[in-house]
């Protein structure tokens, strides 16, 4: 019997200082570039080596960025989201959603990764 894959979703506020080469990551998503089915949100697709995000260490590929400096990223065109980051200033506050994959044991049995009970 196959194990069940669950996701643990957490949110975090990440404050980055723009480095000499910028913030140091790529994004995908937007209303005109849906990366996840039925979700026009903005996701991190690449963390650049030695960039500000990589050196900070908290932002991860696959994270969903919910807001930039308090501005919601819902219902934005892809390029508008890119421009928002580029114009965000020196100190940039990101509200992000991490989605951690949790592998549980077979259905009907409690596996090591299952906190229930």
């Amino acid at each position: 019997m196959n194990g069940r894959v669950d996701y643990l979703v957490t949110e975090e506020e990440i404050n980055l200082t723009r480095g000499p080469s910028g913030l140091g990551f790529n994004i995908v998503g937007g209303t005109d570039q849906q990366y996840v089915s039925n979700d026009s949100g903005i996701y991190v697709s690449r963390i650049k080596e030695n960039g500000a995000a990589a050196l900070d260490g908290r932002l991860q590929e696959g994270d969903k960025i919910l807001s930039v400096n308090g501005q919601d990223l819902k219902n934005l065109l892809h390029q508008d989201a890119v421009d928002l980051f580029r114009n965000a200033g020196y100190a940039v506050s990101l509200r992000v959603q991490h989605r951690l994959q949790v592998q549980n044991g077979p259905i009907g049995h409690r596996g090591e990764g299952d906190p229930s009970g």
Partner: nanobody
Framework: EVQLVESGGGLVQAGGSLRLSCAAS????????MAWFRQAPGKEREFVAA????????YYADSVKGRFTIFRDNAKNMVYLQMNNLKPEDTAVYYC?????????????????????WGQGTQVTVS
């Protein structure tokens, strides 16, 4: 893991044309920023052209402007380089490159560090 496979290279006379193709793996090809670079023997890898995820923006090296055209077909996971009026100095191995998504920083299409994935290359020889 993204895989890129170039094809379409060959031997052509000066003034002739070739169309290079790059086939990319991955279900999210439509989010990739794509580029072509080239490397001649004994020289450094040189930027040729790049194209944004939806084809809305294209970028060219001065040496190929007006002769080369980059375009893509997201339905087929393909990017192309149409090369016209070829010159002997265009002789090189041509490489396809990809970055997943768009940088949130200022984009330098000619910087190889902008791209994560590279093909093995296809030889173009202009006699």
């Amino acid at each position: 893991e993204v895989q890129l496979v170039e094809s379409g290279g060959g031997l052509v006379q000066a003034g002739g044309s070739l169309r290079l193709s790059c086939a990319a793996s991955g279900r999210t090809f439509s989010t990739y920023t794509m580029a072509w670079f080239r490397q001649a023997p004994g020289k450094e890898r040189e930027f040729v052209a790049a194209i944004s995820w939806n084809g809305g923006s294209t970028y060219y090296a001065d040496s190929v402007k007006g002769r080369f055209t980059i375009f893509r077909d997201n339905a087929k996971n393909m990017v192309y380089l149409q090369m016209n009026n070829l010159k002997p100095e265009d002789t090189a191995v041509y490489y396809c490159a990809a970055a997943i998504g768009s940088t949130v920083d200022s984009y330098d299409p000619g910087d190889p560090l902008e791209y994560d994935y590279w093909g093995q290359g296809t030889q173009v020889t202009v006699s």
